[in-house]
Interface confidence: low
């Protein structure tokens, strides 16, 4: 299906920038891995590069404003022609749910005191209002609560005095039209407007003030324009050469508004002075190689020794990584393909252990499924032997760090009937629904 192709992908917002054009295939658009595409206008923007996870979104607001609730955040697999870690397809959302508490207590209503005395009338003539007040302290509200109803009330009051009415101008009437609309007749055109002292008229008893200023205004019609000439387009110029050497680019044609040139305020030519076309080099753009993540460390061994496990004998181990995705003369991966380190093997070694403190509470699982729970653990943690942390393997090469490697067999006293892991689980409260934020915007 055709897509909208863009020249930039903005990592921070996940938005497509620099529209190149529509009606091209994803494969053609993604000849350049710096480009991005949308399946429809306003839809999800996917970059052409290898897929990887976006940053986590900010945590959504807590599902309740007081006491314990839950909140969600998400990240999205973005990219093309591959999968994110975990074999996840582009467009997929991953969710996290955690417990939250904006405010420990919930608000409690207060009660009103009795009404205070009435204040004086708000005006000295005609009718006004007067006000009385009461306090929200009987009892005072708790934890940000409030009292129901109003802290003050008003009623009408009458001073029994008539107020004077001062005169005010109504709005100006329209200017009388000038005798001509473009250049020079035999007389100098004038325009006039008037207004009335009627908004309102001044009162007689008690006497109000008259309107200040003049009831008429006159001016000359100056700067009448010469009669206008509308502009017209000249022919389209030549098509510019394709500006790129690989993938898709954009060529342009231009025309000038000079057939004729607009004069005396006549309108400029309608439409665009430039038009663009997509040009296709049909050449794929170079793709630089990217290192895969490191592989597992190989077993810790020492040459010419059958086993060094559970002994104070340093060995060596290595791990490798693969340079993937290099195509069309892109750059090779920088750095080493193999990593070597010194190690002590504690694989399957029976070691004395001790129980860890409780871990922090984990995320609520499943975040989008029924009845999510969170858990914490205490682990039987092995006490590592006190072997030297560095060794000198070859004369003149200095000290090298030595790392413990392998999965030992820790021994702890039984705790709650368990030998290795003690787990505590709790349900997550006030769980909100998982909704795709892209679909919420529509």
């Amino acid at each position: 299906d055709p897509v909208l192709c863009f020249t930039q992908y903005e990592e921070s917002s996940g938005k497509c920038k620099g529209l190149l054009g529509g009606g091209v295939s994803v494969e053609d658009c993604c000849l350049n891995t710096a480009f991005a595409y949308q399946k429809r206008s306003g839809g999800l923007c996917q970059p052409c590069r290898s897929p990887r996870w976006s940053l986590w979104s900010t945590w959504a607001p807590c599902s309740v404003t007081c006491s314990e609730g839950s909140q969600l955040r998400y990240r999205r697999c973005v990219g093309w022609n591959g999968q994110c870690s975990g074999k996840v397809a582009p467009g997929t959302l991953e969710w996290q749910l955690q417990a939250c508490e904006d405010q420990q207590c919930c608000p409690e209503m207060g009660g009103w005191s009795g009404w205070g005395p009435w204040e004086p009338c708000s005006v000295t003539c005609s009718k006004g209002t007067r006000t009385r007040r009461r306090a929200c302290n009987h009892p005072a509200p708790k934890c940000g609560g409030h009292c129901p109803g109003q802290a003050q009330e008003s009623e009408a009051c009458d001073t029994q005095q008539v107020c004077p009415t001062h005169g005010a101008w109504a709005t100006w009437g329209p200017w009388t039209p000038c005798s001509a609309s473009c250049h020079g007749g035999p007389h100098e055109p004038k325009e006039t407007r008037s207004r009335k002292c009627s908004a309102p008229e001044p009162s007689q008893k008690p006497p109000g003030k008259p309107c200040p200023g003049l009831a008429y205004e006159q001016r000359r019609c100056t700067g009448l324009p010469p009669c206008p000439v509308a502009g017209g387009w000249g022919p389209w110029g030549p098509v510019s050469p394709c500006p790129v050497t690989c993938g898709l680019g954009q060529t342009m044609e231009q025309r000038t508004c000079n057939h004729p040139v607009p004069q005396h305020g006549g309108p400029f030519c309608a439409g665009d002075a430039t038009r663009t076309h997509i040009c296709n080099t049909a050449v794929p753009c170079p793709v630089d190689g990217e290192w895969d993540s490191w592989g597992e460390w190989s077993p810790c061994i020492r040459r010419n020794m059958k086993s060094i496990s559970c002994q104070e004998i340093p060995g060596q181990q290595s791990r490798g990584r693969t340079c993937r995705g290099r195509k069309f003369d892109g750059h090779r991966c920088a750095g080493q393909q193999q990593d070597i380190r010194h190690c002590y093997s504690i694989q399957h070694c029976p070691l004395k252990g001790s129980w860890s403190e409780w871990s922090t509470w984990g995320l609520c699982m499943p975040p989008c499924g029924p009845n999510p729970t969170r858990a914490r653990q205490r682990l039987c943690t092995p006490l590592l032997p006190k072997y030297p942390p560095t060794v000198s393997m070859v004369e003149g090469q200095g000290e090298k760090n030595v790392t413990f490697w392998g999965r030992p067999l820790p021994r702890c006293e039984e705790l709650q009937g368990q030998k290795l892991v003690v787990e505590e689980k709790r349900p997550c409260l006030h769980v909100p629904a998982c909704k795709d934020p892209e679909e919420e915007e529509l």
Partner: nanobody
């Protein structure tokens, strides 16, 4: 987006049969599993039956042997054939679809699912005693 439209509901005597249909339109290439839910007044919504894109089915214990779910991929339609209907089958029946995105999401989370993210409007089924 996927749109789901149910049909085939109505009033039927106990022991009778009905066939519900749910037609999908829109981004139908995005659909993985499809299923039927029901909700009786004052009760929780419950899964009746569902069927994956490969055709494997799953039924609630209360309808096993009486209801059959099937899928016509060419017509983008899922059916629920309901036989030996009982008064306790009276409910609003709603069709649901799970997107491929949600199915990948739940596999990653280790949740057996399906996680339905598209829903129809529902059709009323009334079984009289």
């Amino acid at each position: 987006q996927v749109q789901l439209v149910e049909s085939g509901g109505g009033l039927v005597q106990a022991g009778g049969s009905l066939r519900l249909s749910c037609a999908a339109s829109g981004s139908i290439f995005d659909i993985n599993a499809m299923g039927w839910y029901r909700q009786a007044p004052g009760k929780q919504r419950e899964l009746v039956a569902d069927i994956t894109s490969s055709g494997s089915t799953n039924y609630a214990d209360s309808v096993k042997g009486r209801f059959t779910i099937s899928r016509d991929n060419a017509k983008n339609t899922v059916y629920l054939q309901m036989n030996s209907l009982k008064p306790e089958d009276t409910a609003v029946y709603t069709c649901a679809a799970e997107s491929i995105r949600e199915s990948q999401n739940r596999h990653q989370l280790g949740y057996m699912g399906p996680l339905y993210d598209y829903w129809g409007q529902g059709t009323q089924v009334t079984v009289s005693g």
